[in-house]
Interface confidence: medium
């Protein structure tokens, strides 16, 4: 069983809100991790969207609009990415990853390589 799990695809109507789920395997505690979200459009490198540890400890990627937001459900061991006012350009692959709080700056300051880290999962928003 992979460390992280995301549904392979999700869709919603334009203008609505969609919530992507990233579930961490039960032998890990999401409470101690920051959840990182990346977006990748076809033919483009991934870009960092946001990092979420808690409401008081989170960061948005540069120029990422506030309609992208993160949250966590510690009881269910899940991280969430909500995209409100869904737009055509939001059609993309979304990757979640877990990282320690302390490595926030290094984690979010790099684009990912073609081979995603083992702790990465993805959801396509068609």
């Amino acid at each position: 069983q992979p460390v992280l799990h995301q549904p392979p695809a999700m869709s919603s109507a334009l203008g609505t809100t969609i919530r992507l789920t990233c579930t961490l395997r039960n032998d890990h505690d999401i409470g101690v991790y920051s959840v990182y979200w990346y977006q990748q459009r076809p033919g483009h490198p991934p870009r960092f969207l946001l990092r979420y540890f808690s409401q008081s400890d989170k960061s948005q990627g540069p120029q990422v609009p506030p309609r992208f937001s993160g949250s966590k459900d510690v009881a269910r061991n899940r991280g969430y990415l909500s995209i409100s006012e869904l737009q055509p350009e939001d059609e993309a692959m979304y990757y979640c990853a877990m990282g320690a709080r302390s490595s926030e700056k290094e984690e979010r300051e790099r684009e990912w390589e073609e081979e995603m880290e083992p702790t990465a999962a993805r959801t396509r928003v068609p």
Epitope: H44, Q63, E111, E113
Partner: antibody, heavy 120, light 107 residues
Framework: EVQLVESGGGLVKPGGSLRLSCAAS????????MSWVRQAPGKGLEWVAY????????YYADSVKGRFTISRDNAKNSLYLQMNSLRAEDTAVYYC?????????????WGQGTLVTVSS | DIQLTQSPSFLSASVGDRVTITCRAS??????LAWYQQKPGKAPKLLIY???TLQSGVPSRFSGSGSGTEFTLTISSLQPEDFATYYC?????????FGGGTKVEIK
Amino acid sequence: EVQLVESGGGLVKPGGSLRLSCAASGFTFSTYGMSWVRQAPGKGLEWVAYINNGSGYIYYADSVKGRFTISRDNAKNSLYLQMNSLRAEDTAVYYCARGQWWSGGDFDYWGQGTLVTVSS
Amino acid sequence: DIQLTQSPSFLSASVGDRVTITCRASQGINTWLAWYQQKPGKAPKLLIYAASTLQSGVPSRFSGSGSGTEFTLTISSLQPEDFATYYCQQLNSYPLTFGGGTKVEIK
């Protein structure tokens, strides 16, 4: 202060080779995608090549594909463009440009440019 | 490849004029468009990204609008330092492409 300084331009004969370098300073080079953009004398801008921060994603303009190679050395804060089989139409000022962190595809900092002249 | 067509190619205007430059894309690019200003012998300077977001340090007299295939760059009140060539650029897909440029000259 962000600085990008190109070097390596000059006069070369058709069919020849040249290697351009771009020395970056004032920012964490290893976290940014970089591009080369060129401008022929009296003409507009033409994007040439892109490389992401870890070299895992590389793209080229059709006009240079198979002849030019973009690379980088993050330890040296340097970007390179190896140009082979040069043609007269490659004559241009070559700019090194930093991709915006959020997209990589638009450029918030540019070097001063280095002139490449291909002529017999 | 996505083609960008800028109009006009040349524009004569006076200080204080309101100037509008148009950029049309050959296919829809949402808001993946940037605008640059270039002065003779200098490197381009980013003015606007994401079609309408002003780059830090750029005067507020510059504004961008549009989405899909039609975009505009507006200078609300032309200043002496604004006489330059302006380029649009799409980053919707690779290869990245630029418009042909619009040269703004003193009338």
